[in-house]
């Protein structure tokens, strides 16, 4: 494939990399989904301005990011290093809370309305934002 | 209402180390991040160091990286500063200041002043 | 880093004058700007945050507006305990920046 050099119309460039912001709620699964078929994957927070840029878009809602621990740690799914990389929970939290009686405990990662992180049930329907970097190779053909 | 304490500071000669504290009260240690920031005298602010409220992430600004290390202990509510290899142009009023919204400092202490000096 | 340039860096004023303090970022930083107040011998007070927003218990004579590089800082009716030095600081990545200060003198 060709060498993404812009971003696609509606999504938004920071720092080399192309995020898109939903206004309609998905379950992380289903969200996760979507942005692969956008050749991209829920946003993964590397960095203090990266939290900073995504919170300014995303303003104070719930918001699905990709970070998950449904198998165990905690995993972002680029493969970013979760251990030694920017963390941003809210006090508490992660606590795999079970009490909310939907089954299981909290195995995916959101924005919450301050912009610091929970976890909470993958089924619930918050939005999301995915994200792809520039310069990596796209799925589509190249134009003639 | 919400009390920063800073202590620790003092006289010190180039080279050598100090630690300064800074012990909170009021409010809920455990779930705020915590700042250093200094004034030199009569001079303009800078930051100096960053801990997360469960310490898990730490900034330096790039004039003290190496040398002064930022913790905390949120079982007696105090902050530190470990401030190594010391130099002239770290003599300032260090203040220690709470963080709300990452980056914004709401509450600060009423200041510790370290002069480095032979 | 991102540079934090206020101006002016110091103003005359009388009771009652309507001032404005400027900050210009080097960068954008979206509308992660912050404004304290310092009085001689003590901390600086946080007055607004995040570009525009108040923090409790401050006067609604200030104001601040701005967002991207440039920003302001507003008092529409300057008020005895209004003099004092004031620094804009931004947010959006560390190492985190303090504009120079601007001292608010009475005239």
């Known amino acids: 494939g060709s060498e993404r050099t812009c971003c696609p119309v509606n999504w938004v460039e920071h720092e080399r990399s192309c995020y898109w912001f939903s206004r309609s709620g998905k379950a992380w699964a289903d969200a996760d989904n979507y942005c692969r078929l956008e050749d991209a994957h829920l946003v993964v927070v590397t960095s203090w301005e990266e939290q900073k840029f995504v919170q300014h878009h995303i303003g104070p809602v719930n918001t699905w990011m990709g970070l998950h621990d449904q198998n165990g740690p905690w995993k972002w799914v680029d493969g970013t290093d979760y251990e030694t990389g920017f963390k941003n929970w809210r006090p508490e939290q992660p606590d795999d809370w079970y009490g909310h009686g939907l089954g299981g405990g909290e195995d995916c990662a959101h924005f919450t309305d301050d912009g610091r992180w929970n976890d909470d049930v993958c089924q619930r329907p918050y939005r999301w934002v995915c994200e792809t970097e520039l310069d990596k190779a796209s799925q589509e053909p190249p134009l003639l | 209402q919400v009390q920063l304490v800073e202590s620790g500071g003092g006289v010190v000669q180039p080279g050598r180390s100090l630690r300064l504290s800074c012990a909170a009260s009021?409010?809920?240690?455990?779930?705020?991040?915590m700042h250093w920031v200094r004034q030199t005298p009569g001079k303009g602010l800078e930051w100096v160091a960053v801990?997360?409220?469960?310490?898990?992430?730490?900034y330096y600004a790039d004039s003290v990286k190496g040398r002064f290390t930022i913790s905390r202990d949120n079982s007696k509510n105090t902050l530190y500063l470990q401030m190594n290899s010391l130099r002239a142009e770290d003599t300032a009023v260090y203040y220690c200041?709470?963080?709300?919204?990452?980056?914004?400092?709401?509450?600060w202490g009423q200041g510790t002043l370290v002069t480095v000096s032979s | 880093d991102i540079q934090m340039t206020q101006s002016p860096s110091s103003l005359s004023a009388s009771v009652g004058d309507r001032i404005t303090i400027t900050c210009r970022a080097s960068?954008?930083?979206?509308?992660?700007l912050n404004w304290y107040q310092q009085k001689p011998g003590k901390a600086p007070k946080l007055l607004i945050y995040?570009?525009?927003s108040f923090q409790s218990g401050v006067p609604s004579r200030f104001s601040g507006s701005g967002s991207g590089t440039d920003f302001t800082l507003t008092i529409s009716s300057l008020q005895p305990d209004d003099f004092a030095t004031y620094y804009c600081?931004?947010?959006?990545?560390?190492?985190?920046?303090f504009g120079g200060g601007t001292k608010v003198e009475i005239k």
């Open positions: 600081q931004q947010s959006y990545s560390p190492p985190l920046t």
């Open positions: 801990i997360w409220h469960d310490g898990s992430n730490k």
């Open positions: 960068q954008s930083i979206l509308s992660y």
């Open positions: 009021a409010f809920t240690f455990s779930s705020y991040g």
């Open positions: 995040v570009a525009s």
């Open positions: 200041a709470r963080d709300e919204q990452l980056g914004t400092f709401d509450y």
